[in-house]
Amino acid sequence: EAHKSEIAHRFKDLGEQHFKGLVLIAFSQYLQKCPYEEHIKLVQEVTDFAKTCVADENAENCDKSIHTLFGDKLCAIPKLRDNYGELADCCAKQEPERNECFLQHKDDNPNLPPFQRPEAEAMCTSFQENPTSFLGHYLHEVARRHPYFYAPELLYYAEKYNEVLTQCCTESDKAACLTPKLDAVKEKALVAAVRQRMKCSSMQRFGERAFKAWAVARMSQRFPNAEFAEITKLATDVTKINKECCHGDLLECADDRAELAKYMCENQATISSKLQACCDKPVLQKSQCLAEIEHDNIPADLPSIAADFVEDKEVCKNYAEAKDVFLGTFLYEYSRRHPDYSVSLLLRLAKKYEATLEKCCAEGDPPACYGTVLAEFQPLVEEPKNLVKTNCELYEKLGEYGFQNAVLVRYTQKAPQVSTPTLVEAARNLGRVGTKCCTLPEAQRLPCVEDYLSAILNRLCVLHEKTPVSEKVTKCCSGSLVERRPCFSALTVDETYVPKEFKAETFTFHSDICTLPDKEKQIKKQTALAELVKHKPKATEDQLKTVMGDFAQFVDKCCKAADKDNCFATEGPNLVARSKEALA
């Protein structure tokens, strides 16, 4: 239904706390360089204005769209051009072009320092002094670094953050309590960020239909007892919600997400038997719980998929007359039978089925042509299964850090033109798939591995798109979203690459490496490894192992030395010389 004042409507629906959080996220995602203080001032102005509209929907400007109101606020910021350059040009445009322009200027890799967690004591002090401000800073810092983070989910993580601090700041050993708990929240939030970026990429590049297909597959796996009409309704709603969030309509997105949770909880009987525990929770937790819900049990009496999609005489007629419904039904039926497949794989199978019908239906004997289509799925299913098997075996053998290094070597060979920081980030994230997925039961491994890898590779594509350097990466990234992972897996050593000259300074280290946290130390070593591969793309595994082992020993030795600086200065050149020799 239409409301006189959209901003009043959203304020009333969401409540002041969530309203303010979402407005802060929106501003932080649009203007990523502005300090917290500047954004919070705007948030307060918008909130005060919303309250006047709640009091009187006919008040001046209350009838304006939220994009218009937010855009006007952003465009009124002094020195916008000085800080944001051409983003200021957006302000010359009218809505909806202005908002589109803001979206195009979102930076997936903003030049911001990594978010440093303060010491436990300092954190607790500032949290206890002003919890609202503390959590506001959290929303701001995460949102500006992740401009596509799913806003209602970020509110949930802020709530989690709040819970952890409330609990741990009363403990005697605050750090021991905080560190593992906040690490867990951070890990979940980072995965959520790449997953949502992939959803927005899907929406931006391939439109709503592609996203809806993803949603149908996912919902069908989770709710195999729900009817197709129910799954379609849920998928349509989820598509709308994600479109809104990806498009910067965060208030509408959060409001609609809460509505969907309400709908699901009111219709548990026709959706899933697993929802009840979620439905007793408050709104943010309820939505999050529903988004992470375990799969319902598959109905016992499902007939063979072949009956309706191969043996039925009307297959071609049904396909030609309503592809969306017929192929949607195929995707639903196949997905509800296969919670053990990744969504990417299910979409590839649906695409293969569609392509087969498109090829066969006009022929003289269509059933003879498409009759073996289900058997032709086998190689498509085997490929990711083998990927999971070989990678999990490698992970079990090497551990997370060793596995990351193996992935780093592989990807540097595939795309040596890509910047070393991007390769290291991608390899570290890809390498985490082992810890995340390989320990799961067999039936959960494939969906976990492939859908996670797809999201990480999407991040690589997004970064590469900004400054394209590798034709191979461009080719994999510009194809269909579901084909990306197989495309990257199939890449081999780039034979066109001219090896980088050996620069001693790239492999020169100083005593500062000794005081770095383990993670930073690993990154330094992995940076050196990528540079080695760029210098010698065809180096054997043994050669790289020798050099990296030598390097680790060198760092270890010098960090234990009495005169660290002297050790690095004298031993460093020897290491460089030995490395050059080992790789010759």
């Epitope: 439109g207 071609c316 030609a320 592809k323 019908l357 498109e358 239906c361 022929e363 003289g364």
Partner: antibody, heavy 119, light 110 residues
Framework: EVQLLESGGGLVQPGGSLRLSCAVS????????INWVRQAPGKGLEWIGI?????TTFYATWAKGRFTISRDSTTVYLQMNSLRAEDTAVYYC???????????????WGQGTLVTVSS | DIVMTQSPSSVSASVGDRVTITCQSS???????LSWYQQKPGKAPKLLIY???KLTSGVPSRFKGSGSGTDFTLTISSLQPEDFATYYC???????????FGGGTKVEIK
């Protein structure tokens, strides 16, 4: 050489009927889909319908009921009933690119036959 | 209702010019089922591009198709004398019965 050749056009009175033929040579018709497309004088192209190799037919929403497509081993037909002045057009038959069934990719066309509906 | 809007309806250009024709579809076409045809007076149309961007065999590389979903473009990078003609886009949808052509764009000599 592959050829599609339409015939059967001419002057017909409003309310009348006409059957157009599309003779296909140089290919085995039993493996291809054939479409009918029309073009009113000075106007754009308008898809009428398709017949698959199996004989299954589909029509544009506006064409259902008045137009019927059929085929034999070498010829595809378009039966047009209850003709109106606005049906005046050049009628083409065209082959769908092999490997496609429902896509609007027509690689071989006849030269067209003019149908004039007038009293 | 399916609407396929081609623009401009006509364009005057000279040999060597770059010409761009757009085709907007509502709703979006199915699976990039979008084709471009060239038609000269008194002749049947000729398929230039299918699947939005694939060139039919024998079609010169100065013809380029791009786009996806609802917005598509045909670009002729350097117009040749034989390119003066009318161009049509054709779209396929969820239902084959909705197969539609755009209104056409006439490329004339300036």
């Amino acid at each position: 050489e592959v050829q599609l050749l339409e015939s059967g056009g001419g002057l017909v009175q409003p309310g009348g009927s006409l059957r157009l033929s599309c003779a296909v040579s140089g290919i085995d018709l039993s493996n291809y889909a054939i479409n009918w497309v029309r073009q009113a004088p000075g106007k754009g192209l308008e898809w009428i319908g398709i017949i698959w190799a199996s004989g299954t037919t589909f029509y544009a929403t506006w064409a259902k009921g008045r137009f019927t497509i059929s085929r034999d081993s070498t010829t595809v037909y378009l039966q047009m009933n209850s003709l109106r002045a606005e049906d005046t057009a050049v009628y083409y038959c065209a082959r769908t690119v092999p490997g496609y069934s429902t896509a609007p990719y027509f690689d071989l066309w006849g030269q067209g036959t003019l149908v004039t509906v007038s009293s | 209702d399916i609407v396929m809007t081609q623009s401009p309806s006509s364009v005057s250009a000279s040999v060597g010019d770059r010409v761009t024709i757009t085709c907007q579809s509502s709703p979006s076409v199915w699976s990039n089922f979008l084709s471009w045809y060239q038609q000269k007076p008194g002749k049947a149309p000729k398929l230039l591009i299918y699947e939005a961007s694939k060139l039919t065999s024998g079609v010169p590389s100065r013809f380029k198709g791009s786009g996806s979903g609802t917005d598509f473009t045909l670009t002729i990078s350097s117009l040749q004398p034989e390119d003066f003609a009318t161009y049509y886009c054709g779209g396929g949808y969820s239902s084959i019965s909705d197969t539609t052509f755009g209104g056409g764009t006439k490329v004339e000599i300036k």
